[in-house]
Amino acid sequence: GQNITARIGEPLVLSCKGAPKKPPQQLEWKLNTGRTEAWKVLSPQGGPWDSVARILPNGSLLLPATGIVDEGTFRCRATNRRGKEVKSNYRVRVYQIPGKPEIVDPASELTASVPNKVGTCVSEGSYPAGTLSWHLDGKLLIPDGKETLVKEETRRHPETGLFTLRSELTVIPTQGGTHPTFSCSFSLGLPRRRPLNTAPIQLRVREPGPPEGIQLLVEPEGGIVAPGGTVTLTCAISAQPPPQVHWIKDGAPLPLAPSPVLLLPEVGHEDEGTYSCVATHPSHGPQESPPVSIRVTETGDEGPAEGSVGESGLGTLA
């Protein structure tokens, strides 16, 4: 048999070998495709199947617009002018080239020694599904699950049957100061079909510097609160990835799950004290914020106590 590849939506003509070019002809076309459950013999007189597969006057079979459901086997059996039976057998596969793949949500820069999401490569409207590959400086990137991690997702459109592919690349660059170029390509895996490439993205890799500073914000401002009130402490840190934040009261760690926000509801005198937060960054170890004092007192009793954060509500460590 002969393997035929046809583009979805395009016409396809399959010739019936041995068939006389004009009637009278003795021929039979049958097909086994996604439209049939077994072999379907086409009527030479034509009929409802003509919209998907029509026998032409010369004995060839015309598929006016091939679709995914037309994938399968097509056979013709013809008797030639000398009375000899000739058979033709075709295995039809269809394909659809998607739009040019794109890298969506690309990173603006990368940080050495930590995982960085480079971006997500998206290809829409392919058949069969095909594959997405990442390239670094023009060379194929092989995911190793450690320094190079690829998360893939394939979805099929419920009506068209066409595929959307997504591939998210995460890398851990080894050193700073470099400018790697990433690109992504889509391949259908068909012969004589070149891959489709995205526009490349060039990213700067910076060495992981210390976080620019920790700010401890307190609400209400000044850290003075009436009994039964609520105090919110927020540890603000500009670091990627976000570090784990623990809390310290009067020099002792609080036995709480890591969180950048500490909420003290219905405060009493036992909640008074000096609070600070500690941010633990994977590549830099812990960093502690300046402390803030919390005072529980009837409002208007006294001004800010010594060591409190004063009017700004901020304690900043540069």
Partner: antibody, heavy 119, light 107 residues
Framework: EVQLVESGVGLVQPGGSLRLSCAAS????????MTWVRQAPGKGLEWVAS????????YYPDSVKDRFTISRDNAKNSLYLQMNSLRAEDTAVYYC????????????WGQGTLVTVSS | DIQMTQSPSSLSASVGDRVTITCRAS??????VNWFQQKPGKAPRRLIY???NLADGVPSRFSGSRSGTDFTLTISSLQPEDFATYYC?????????FGGGTKVEIK
């Protein structure tokens, strides 16, 4: 909304001719096969003719072959049935329907028009 | 030509009843069968396409099934508006062939 509206003079003598029309709207007419179906008074449904979306290929049952001709004008979104050599047994309500090939079957139907063949 | 033998030709049922109508094709027609509902003086309305698929806007109490060349239309709980005549249609081969119809009447 898909709409099919049949029209054509209702009473004709045996041996006479009649042309039915069907005006289509609410869909891309030239993407669909079209079909005529009839129903004699108190009887079941009978296929009369089909035409492919381009108008190049037409199909008939033996009962009307060589007497009836189905045609279409895609520019006017219109379907026609030319009926010649009419017989008493052609008396029926004639329906225009969208489809007729294996992708659709018949999905939308017009309200029908009554053709009476009588002397 | 393909024959579509529809049974029963008529039936009496009450509101809430489960109703089953069958069409048997004289040869293999694949999945290429539609079911229609027709009320007096009205055009047929498609209920089921390609043997088992519910057409848009049709209540879910209607369903279609297939076993070889036997096709079944089921109304799970008959409603007052369901009293009508039902037809099957094969559209796998020409001539397109309808079943003889089943008239569903109030008991």
């Amino acid at each position: 909304e898909v709409q099919l509206v049949e029209s054509g003079v209702g009473l004709v003598q045996p041996g006479g001719s009649l042309r039915l029309s069907c005006a289509a709207s609410g869909f891309t007419f030239n993407n669909y096969w079209m079909t005529w179906v009839r129903q004699a008074p108190g009887k079941g449904l009978e296929w009369v003719a089909s035409i492919d979306n381009s108008g190049d290929n037409t199909y008939y049952p033996d009962s009307v072959k060589d007497r009836f001709t189905i045609s279409r004008d895609n520019a006017k979104n219109s379907l026609y049935l030319q009926m010649n050599s009419l017989r008493a047994e052609d008396t029926a309500v004639y329906y225009c329907a969208r489809g007729g090939d294996i992708t659709n079957g018949l999905d939308y139907w017009g309200q029908g028009t009554l053709v009476t063949v009588s002397s | 030509d393909i024959q579509m033998t529809q049974s029963p030709s008529s039936l009496s049922a009450s509101v809430g009843d489960r109703v089953t109508i069958t069409c048997r094709a004289s040869q293999d027609v694949g999945i290429y069968v539609n079911w229609f509902q027709q009320k007096p003086g009205k055009a047929p309305r498609r209920l089921i396409y390609r043997a088992t698929n519910l057409a848009d806007g049709v209540p879910s109490r209607f369903s279609g099934s297939r076993s070889g060349t036997d096709f079944t239309l089921t109304i799970s709980s008959l409603q007052p508006e369901d009293f009508a005549t039902y037809y099957c249609l094969e559209f796998d081969e020409h001539p397109l062939t309808f079943g003889g119809g089943t008239k569903v009447e109030i008991k």
